[in-house]
């Protein structure tokens, strides 16, 4: 899959998990760096992932809920992410400066179902993101929604 | 109810450019991604890319990159199909496609748009 | 990339008879996290756009008759019509969504 940011270190990679989706996210931010990522799959938080140290934010996934698309930053080390969701919802971790890229699916539906990447002591060096069609496929048809949201806090 | 319609047959010279468009009536297109499918006379079908109308991401079938470029304007429901540097192997039917209410398959289909490249 | 294809390229059959067309992909098409098949049917009558018919390889869409059966797993998939009709005179084409979105060359049904 592909990487973003300039690698080097050790590898991390959350567990493969054919059985539960991504319910919720940890990420760890210390001196302007993100430091490590934990994701929760059903119930269960899975292995703290990168370096030690930093405060934590968490979030919790609704019901139903996917992340769809994630913008990264990198300076070195991976500075901070923007996660968006399928219900119109995103999460800021760390801060958006230096290298911006945007990962996404290359198959419409998909969702996010793992992180990979490098890490060394300071933070992480690179990150990937494993994309696959969620395990429980939607039951109706999306409304007709002819509002129009917000501007994104990030350009296109 | 859902409905795709598409421009006009265009009759084009070897080497110009030509959009395509899409109006889309009956849903949101920032609620879709917009596909581009090709059909050459009497030949198979070829997908071309997607657009996702809401953020502007686009995927290409590495064959159709730097021949094809996809955009949208949500403000008036439309999705575009830009073609390049045309040739006569550029002579075909483009539809666009959405999915309906499952990802991964086109239940919704343009009526088509033919493109003659001609001298 | 994925190379889906079909066989055969055309057939005439009679109203009323069973028909039976094949799908191989060069790679398979089952997800194994979601332990389903991405693999489509598609039916295009003479001017006309395609039709989703059958999806997941075996579920049909809704409004298609049921002599519309898809079978199959992996790499080798089958869509048979229990008995023909004069209008199911077309084009019929499988599509794989495993990985962007390719599609096999078609099979032409002809009634005789």
């Known amino acids: 899959g592909k990487m973003y940011g300039p690698g080097g270190g050790k590898y991390f990679s959350t567990t493969e998990d054919y059985d539960h989706e991504i319910t919720g996210l940890r990420v760890s931010v210390g001196l302007l760096l993100v430091k490590s990522v934990q994701v929760k799959l059903g119930d269960s938080w899975d292995v703290k992932l990168g370096a030690l140290g930093g405060n934590t934010q968490e979030v919790t996934l609704q019901p139903g809920e996917y992340i769809t698309k994630v913008f990264v930053a990198f300076q070195a080390f991976l500075r901070g992410m923007v996660m968006y969701t399928s219900k119109d919802r995103y999460f800021y971790f760390g801060k958006l400066d230096g290298q911006i890229s945007s990962a996404y699916p290359s198959q419409e539906g998909q969702v996010l179902v793992g992180i990979y990447g490098q890490y060394q002591l300071l933070g992480i060096k690179s990150i990937g993101f494993e994309w696959n069609y969620p395990l429980e496929e939607p039951t109706t048809e999306p409304p007709v929604n002819l509002t129009y949201s917000a501007n994104s806090p990030v350009g296109r | 109810q859902v409905q795709l319609k598409e421009s006009g047959a265009e009759l084009v010279r070897p080497g110009a450019l030509v959009k395509l468009s899409c109006k889309a009536s009956?849903?949101?297109?920032?609620?879709?991604?917009m596909h581009w499918v090709k059909q050459r006379p009497e030949q198979g079908l070829e997908w071309i890319g997607w657009i996702d109308p809401e953020h502007g991401n686009t995927i290409y079938d590495p064959k159709f990159q730097g021949k094809a470029s996809l955009t949208a304007d949500t403000s008036s429901n439309t999705a575009y199909l830009q073609l390049s540097s045309l040739t006569s192997e550029d002579t075909a039917v483009y539809y666009c496609?959405?999915?309906?209410?499952?990802?991964?398959?086109?239940?919704?289909w343009g009526q088509g748009t033919l493109v003659t490249v001609s001298a | 990339d994925i190379v889906m294809t079909q066989s055969p390229s055309s057939l005439a059959v009679s109203a009323g008879e069973k028909v039976t067309l094949s799908c191989k992909s060069s790679?398979?098409?089952?997800?194994?996290?979601?332990?389903?098949?991405?693999l489509a049917w598609y039916q295009q009558k003479p001017g006309q756009s395609p039709k989703l018919l059958i999806y997941?390889?075996?579920t049909r869409e809704s409004g298609v008759p049921d002599r519309f059966t898809g079978s199959g797993s992996g790499t080798d998939f089958t869509l048979t019509i229990s008995s023909v009709q004069a209008e199911d005179l077309a084009v019929y084409y499988c599509?794989?969504?495993?990985?962007?979105?390719?599609f096999g060359g078609g099979t032409k049904l002809e009634i005789k």
């Open positions: 009956g849903f949101n297109i920032k609620d879709y991604y």
């Open positions: 496609a959405r999915r309906g209410w499952l990802p991964a398959w086109f239940a919704y």
């Open positions: 790679q398979s098409l089952l997800n194994s996290r979601t332990r389903k098949n991405y």
């Open positions: 599509k794989q969504s495993y990985n962007l979105y390719t």
């Open positions: 997941w390889a075996s």
